[in-house]
Interface confidence: low
C-alpha cells in the first residue's frame, strides 16, 4: 500500500521526503542546545526548556503547542542539611562519612544547581545498626538469604548494589524483609566495562559516580497524591499517611569508592557463590556487621529530603490529520533530567525535536498526515512516570476513544551495537518492514539493511532469521497509554552487546557524567545511530499516522498467545500433584488462544480482500485493529495493582523494567509451594486462568465479522 | 580470539639487553592488560611485571622496562644487565580485567604466548 | 610483597583418585586466587579464576574454593591428562606472585 494515498499529495510528500528531510548534524546541535543546564523536573530551568520547545514547535509548523501543568509530589534533597552515611565508633563518632555530592566533570564545575545523588521519595531518618550485602535485593536474593542462609535483616541496613532490577522494587524486597534503611551501590562489575576507561577519558563509570533515581512502588498509579485521577487545580489530595508507593524507609545511593569503605569491614556469612561477588577488592562477606575488629563500629544514614507538591509541565503539539482527525498516534518522549541527561532523556529529546522539525517541514508544503499526530514532551518522568500519566489521566476518556499507537522516545543510545525494539506484537511487522527499507549505520553492514544487522546482532531466540523483539514492561512513559489505557505502543534505541546486563542500564547512567561530549565523545561521534534510531521512530509514526490500512498484523498476536500459554502451562505443570489435587486446566486458554489463531487468521484475509475505496468499510476494519489492543484491558486490572490493566502483559512484580506475560496467572503460581492456605493459592490460579482465557475469547471475538 | 605472538629465541651475553615482542591479534589491544612471565629451566614461575597500571617486581626493578606500540598492537620487554640466571623462558600473558584507575581487578592470565627462551651464555 | 606457598610441593596419585593442593597467601587477597596448569614444554592454563570460577573450557571435575589467605583447588577424579604441575597465583595486589608449584605425579 502506498502512504501516498490517504490525502492525496503529491508523490513526494511519501515516507521518503519525511526520512530524507531527518539530518544527524540536526540531532547534534539539539542534543548540545539541551544538556548545557541541569533540567530537573520542578525547576525553573525546566520550565524555561518547555518554553523554549513549545516556542521551536510552534516555529516549525505544528497546528497548536501547549503547556499541560499539574502539581504533584516530587521529592528533592535538603541543601543545607546533605545527605551521607556514615560509619561510626562505639562512642557515636563519625570515622567515615561517604561523599556528598560527585566531582564535576570538566568544564562544568562552575554549573549550579547540581542535585546531588539521592534517592528521591526517600523518607527522612537516621538509622543506625549492622549492615548486611544482600546482593542485587532481587526477591531470589532474598529467599537465598532468609531461606537457605537463615540471615534476618529484621533491624539491619542492607546494602544492595545496583542492576538487574528497577531499584523500587529492591527497597520493597527491603521494606518487607524487615530492614531499616537501603544503601543502594554502582558495583563496577555491572557499571565498569572491562578495558574502557572511567569518564572523562572514556564511558566507564568513575569511583565518584553515582546513580540517581527514584524509589517509588507506584504500579502505574502516577502522581503518589491523586492515583487515577489529574493532579489539577481542584484535586483531592491523599495525606502523605495514604499516598502511593512511598518507601518506608531511608534509602540513599553511593558510588563504588564508598562502597568499598563499607564493604572492605564486612564479617558475617561468606557470599553463598561467586554470583555474590562483584569486582571490588572486598570480601562481599554478608554479614550481618562488621568482622572481627571492626565488629563494635556501625553504620548510619542522614537522610533529610523532602517531599513538595510542585508544579510539573508537559508540552503538547498537535498535527492535525487531514482524513481521520479524530485518531491519535503519538509520539512522547520526557524532557526533565537528573543533571545534564546527556543521554536520558535529551538524546531522545533531540530526535523527537527533528522528526518535528521534518514532520513540520512536510506540512508547510502543503502536506497533512491521514490521522492526527500528538508530539509529548513528558516532565517528571525521573519522578515516576508522573507528567505523562497525569495527561493520560486528563484525557482518558479520549484516548481510549481515539487512541492509535503510542511510541515513546526516551533515551535514543544505551550503547551503539544494535537496535533494540520493544513493542506489542500488532506492529512487529511495521518494525520488520520499515527496518528493511532503512539502511544500516552498522560498521561492516555497509549497503546493507538495518532488518540484516539487527537480525545478525541480535537473533531471535525463537524465528531464525528474525531479529529479536521484546515484551514491553515500564520504567518509561509508554506504561500509562500500554498497560492501563490499552493503546498499542512501541519503543525502539540503538543498545549495547550486553544480554546479561540488560537492567543495568550503561555505566553512567542518571550520573552528572551523562554529558553532551559522552555522546559526542565516545557513543555516537557522526551521532549516525541517532539518526537511525529517529529513523524508526519517526517512521513508525509516519506509517501509523499515514497508512490507509493500520499497519497491525493481528496474526502476530496469536503466534505469542500460544508461545505465552505455553509457557505459563510449563511453570504450572512443576506441580503436577496439586494440578490434580486442585483440578487446575489450562484447556479453557489454550482453547481461547486456538479461537483467537483462527479468527484472526480470517480477519487477515478480509483485510486483503475488502474494498478500499469505501471509506465506512475501511473505517470498520481500521477500529478493529485499533480496538483489539484495547481488547485486553480487564477494568478491574490485576491482583493489588489496579492501574496495570492489560492482561496479557504487566511489569514483573519483581523487576518494574521487565515485561512479564500472562501475569495475573503467573503472580497466582510465584512461590505457590509457599503459600501457607495451598487450597485457596490455587483456587487463585484457577480464577487467573479463568480470566486470562475470557479476556483471550473476548479479544478474539472483537476481530470477528461484525454482522 | 585473541592471539599473542612472541619473537623468537635469543642467545645473549652476559652484560648485554635483550628487547621480547610480543604482537596481538584479536582484539582491542588497548584494552588488554599485559604481563610478564619467566620460568627459568626446571624453575616455577616468576611474574616480572605489567602495565595498566605499569608496575614491576622489586627483583627487577631497574633492569626490565615494558613498553608497547598501539599502533601495531605489539608489547615489549627489555631486560638489560644480563646474568646467567636470567636464562629462561620469557612468558607474554594477557590479564584478564581491568583496572579503574582507582583499583585493578584482575582475575588470571588467560591468555599466554608461545614463549621465548633467552639463553645468557659467554 | 605478598608471598604464596603452596602445599605439597608433590603427590603421586592414581587415576579416579580425588586430590587436593592448597596454597596459602602471606596476608588476605579476598578472592583474587587463581590456578594454572603447566604440561612440560607447555605454557601455562589458566584453570580457575577468582577463587572458585572455572575458566571457560575447563573440565568441571577441577574445582577451586577459599577466601583471604586460605585457598583449595581440588580435582574430583584424576585423569591420565591431568598429570602435570598446577600454580597458584595471587592477582589482589602488585607484584603479583605464583606459589611455588605442586607436581602430580603418576603413582
Known amino acids: 500500500k502506498s502512504s501516498n494515498e490517504a490525502t492525496n499529495i503529491t508523490p513526494k510528500h511519501n515516507m521518503k521526503a519525511f526520512l530524507d528531510e531527518l539530518k544527524a548534524e540536526n540531532i547534534k546541535k539539539f542534543l548540545y542546545n539541551f544538556t548545557q543546564i541541569p533540567h530537573l523536573a520542578g525547576t525553573e530551568q525546566n520550565f524555561q526548556l518547555a518554553k523554549q520547545i513549545q516556542s521551536q514547535w510552534k516555529e516549525f509548523g505544528l497546528d497548536s503547542v501547549e503547556l499541560a501543568h499539574y502539581d504533584v509530589l516530587l521529592s528533592y534533597p535538603n541543601k543545607t542539611h546533605p545527605n551521607y552515611i556514615s560509619i561510626i565508633n562505639e562512642d557515636g563518632n563519625e570515622i567515615f562519612n561517604t561523599s556528598l555530592f560527585e566531582p564535576p566533570p570538566p568544564g562544568y564545575e562552575n554549573v549550579s544547581d547540581i542535585v546531588p545523588p539521592f534517592s528521591a521519595f526517600s523518607p527522612q531518618g537516621m538509622p543506625e545498626g549492622d549492615l548486611v550485602y544482600v546482593n542485587y535485593a532481587r526477591t531470589e536474593d532474598f529467599f537465598k538469604l532468609e531461606r537457605d542462609m537463615k540471615i534476618n535483616c529484621s533491624g539491619k541496613i542492607v546494602i544492595a548494589r545496583y542492576g538487574k532490577v528497577f531499584r523500587g522494587n529492591k527497597v520493597k524486597n527491603a521494606q518487607l524483609a524487615g530492614a531499616k534503611g537501603v544503601i543502594l551501590y554502582s558495583d563496577p562489575a555491572d557499571y565498569f566495562a572491562p578495558g574502557v576507561k572511567s569518564y572523562p577519558d572514556g564511558w566507564n563509570l568513575p569511583g565518584g559516580g553515582v546513580q540517581r533515581g527514584n524509589i517509588l512502588n507506584l504500579n502505574g498509579a502516577g502522581d503518589p497524591l491523586t492515583p487515577g485521577y489529574p493532579a489539577n487545580e481542584y484535586a483531592y489530595r491523599r495525606g502523605i499517611a495514604e499516598a502511593v508507593g512511598l518507601p518506608s524507609i531511608p534509602v540513599h545511593p553511593i558510588g563504588y569508592y564508598d562502597a568499598q569503605k563499607l564493604l572492605e569491614k564486612m564479617g558475617g556469612s561468606a557470599p553463598p557463590d561467586s554470583s555474590w561477588r562483584g569486582s571490588l577488592k572486598v570480601p562481599y562477606n554478608v554479614g550481618p556487621g562488621f568482622t572481627g575488629n571492626f565488629s563494635t563500629q556501625k553504620v548510619k544514614m542522614h537522610i533529610h529530603s523532602t517531599n513538595e507538591v510542585t508544579r510539573i509541565y508537559n508540552v503538547i503539539g498537535t498535527l492535525r490529520g487531514a482524513v481521520e482527525p479524530d485518531r491519535y498516534v503519538i509520539l512522547g518522549g520526557h524532557r526533565d533530567s537528573w543533571v545534564f541527561g546527556g543521554i536520558d532523556p535529551q538524546s531522545g529529546a533531540a530526535v523527537v525535536h527533528e522528526i518535528v522539525r521534518s514532520f513540520g517541514t512536510l506540512k508547510k508544503e502543503g502536506w497533512r498526515p491521514r490521522r492526527t499526530i500528538l508530539f509529548a514532551s513528558w516532565d517528571a518522568e525521573e519522578f515516576g512516570l508522573l507528567g505523562s500519566t497525569e495527561w493520560a489521566e486528563e484525557n482518558s476518556r479520549l484516548l481510549q476513544e481515539r487512541g492509535v499507537a503510542y511510541i515513546n522516545a526516551d533515551s535514543s543510545i544505551e550503547g551503539n551495537y544494535t537496535l533494540r525494539v520493544d513493542c506489542t506484537p500488532l506492529m512487529y511487522s511495521l518494525v520488520h518492514n520499515l527496518t528493511k527499507e532503512l539502511k544500516s549505520p552498522d560498521e561492516g553492514f555497509e549497503g546493507k539493511s538495518l532488518y540484516e544487522s539487527w537480525t545478525k546482532k541480535s537473533p531471535s531466540p525463537e524465528f531464525s532469521g528474525m531479529p529479536r523483539i521484546s515484551k514491553l514492561g515500564s520504567g518509561n512513559d509508554f506504561e500509562v497509554f500500554f498497560q492501563r489505557l490499552g493503546i498499542a505502543s512501541g519503543r525502539a534505541r540503538y543498545t549495547k552487546n550486553w544480554e546479561t546486563n540488560k537492567f543495568s542500564g550503561y555505566p553512567l547512567y542518571h550520573s552528572v557524567y551523562e554529558t553532551y561530549e559522552l555522546v559526542e565523545k565516545f557513543y555516537d561521534p557522526m551521532f549516525k545511530y541517532h539518526l537511525t534510531v529517529a529513523q524508526v521512530r519517526g517512521g513508525m509514526v509516519f506509517e501509523l499516522a499515514n497508512s490507509i490500512v493500520l499497519p497491525f498484523d493481528c496474526r502476530d498476536y496469536a503466534v505469542v498467545l500460544r508461545k505465552y500459554a505455553d509457557k505459563i502451562y510449563s511453570i504450572s505443570m512443576k506441580h503436577p500433584q496439586e494440578m490434580k489435587t486442585y483440578s487446575v486446566s489450562f484447556d479453557s486458554l489454550f482453547s481461547a488462544v486456538k479461537n483467537f489463531t483462527e479468527i484472526a487468521s480470517k480477519f487477515s484475509e478480509r483485510l486483503q480482500d475488502f474494498d478500499k475505496s469505501n471509506p465506512i468499510v475501511l473505517r470498520m476494519m481500521n477500529d478493529q485493529l485499533m480496538f483489539l489492543e484495547r481488547a485486553f484491558i480487564d477494568p478491574l486490572g490485576l491482583p493489588d495493582r489496579p492501574f496495570y490493566r492489560h492482561v496479557i502483559y504487566a511489569p514483573s512484580s519483581h523487576n518494574k523494567y521487565a515485561g512479564e506475560s500472562f501475569p495475573g496467572i503467573y503472580d497466582a503460581l510465584f512461590d505457590i509451594e509457599s503459600k501457607v492456605d495451598p487450597s485457596k493459592a490455587w483456587g487463585e490460579v484457577k480464577r487467573q486462568i479463568y480470566v486470562a482465557a475470557f479476556t483471550v475469547q473476548a479479544a478474539a471475538e472483537t476481530l470477528s465479522e461484525v454482522a | 580470539e585473541v592471539q599473542l605472538v612472541q619473537s623468537g629465541a635469543e642467545v645473549k651475553k652476559p652484560g648485554s639487553s635483550v628487547k621480547v615482542s610480543c604482537k596481538a591479534s584479536?582484539?582491542?589491544?588497548?584494552?588488554?592488560?599485559i604481563s610478564w612471565v619467566r620460568q627459568a629451566p626446571g624453575q616455577g614461575l616468576e611474574w616480572m611485571g605489567g602495565m595498566t597500571p605499569k608496575n614491576y617486581a622489586q627483583k627487577f626493578q631497574g633492569r626490565v622496562t615494558i613498553t608497547a606500540d598501539e599502533s601495531t598492537s605489539t608489547a615489549y620487554m627489555e631486560l638489560s644487565s644480563l646474568r646467567s640466571e636470567d636464562t629462561a623462558v620469557y612468558y607474554c600473558?594477557?590479564?584478564?580485567?581491568?583496572?579503574?584507575?582507582?583499583?585493578?581487578?584482575?582475575?588470571?592470565?588467560?591468555?599466554w604466548g608461545q614463549g621465548t627462551l633467552v639463553t645468557v651464555s659467554s | 610483597d605478598i608471598q604464596m606457598t603452596q602445599s605439597p610441593s608433590s603427590l603421586s596419585a592414581s587415576v579416579g583418585d580425588r586430590v587436593t593442593i592448597t596454597c596459602r597467601a602471606s596476608?588476605?587477597?579476598?578472592?583474587?586466587l587463581n590456578w594454572y596448569q603447566q604440561k612440560p614444554g607447555k605454557a601455562p592454563k589458566l584453570l580457575i579464576y577468582a577463587a572458585s570460577s572455572l575458566q571457560s573450557g575447563v573440565p568441571s571435575r577441577f574445582s577451586g574454593s577459599g577466601s583471604g589467605t586460605d585457598f583449595t583447588l581440588t580435582i574430583s577424579s584424576l585423569q591420565p591428562e591431568d598429570f602435570a604441575t598446577y600454580y597458584c597465583?595471587?592477582?589482589?595486589?602488585?607484584?603479583?606472585?605464583f606459589g611455588q608449584g605442586t607436581k602430580v605425579e603418576i603413582k
Open positions: 597465583q595471587q592477582s589482589h595486589t602488585m607484584p603479583w606472585s
Open positions: 600473558v594477557r590479564a584478564s580485567g581491568y583496572y579503574s584507575g582507582y583499583h585493578s581487578y584482575y582475575y588470571g592470565l588467560d591468555v
Open positions: 596476608q588476605s587477597i579476598s578472592y583474587f
Open positions: 584479536g582484539g582491542t589491544f588497548s584494552s588488554y592488560a
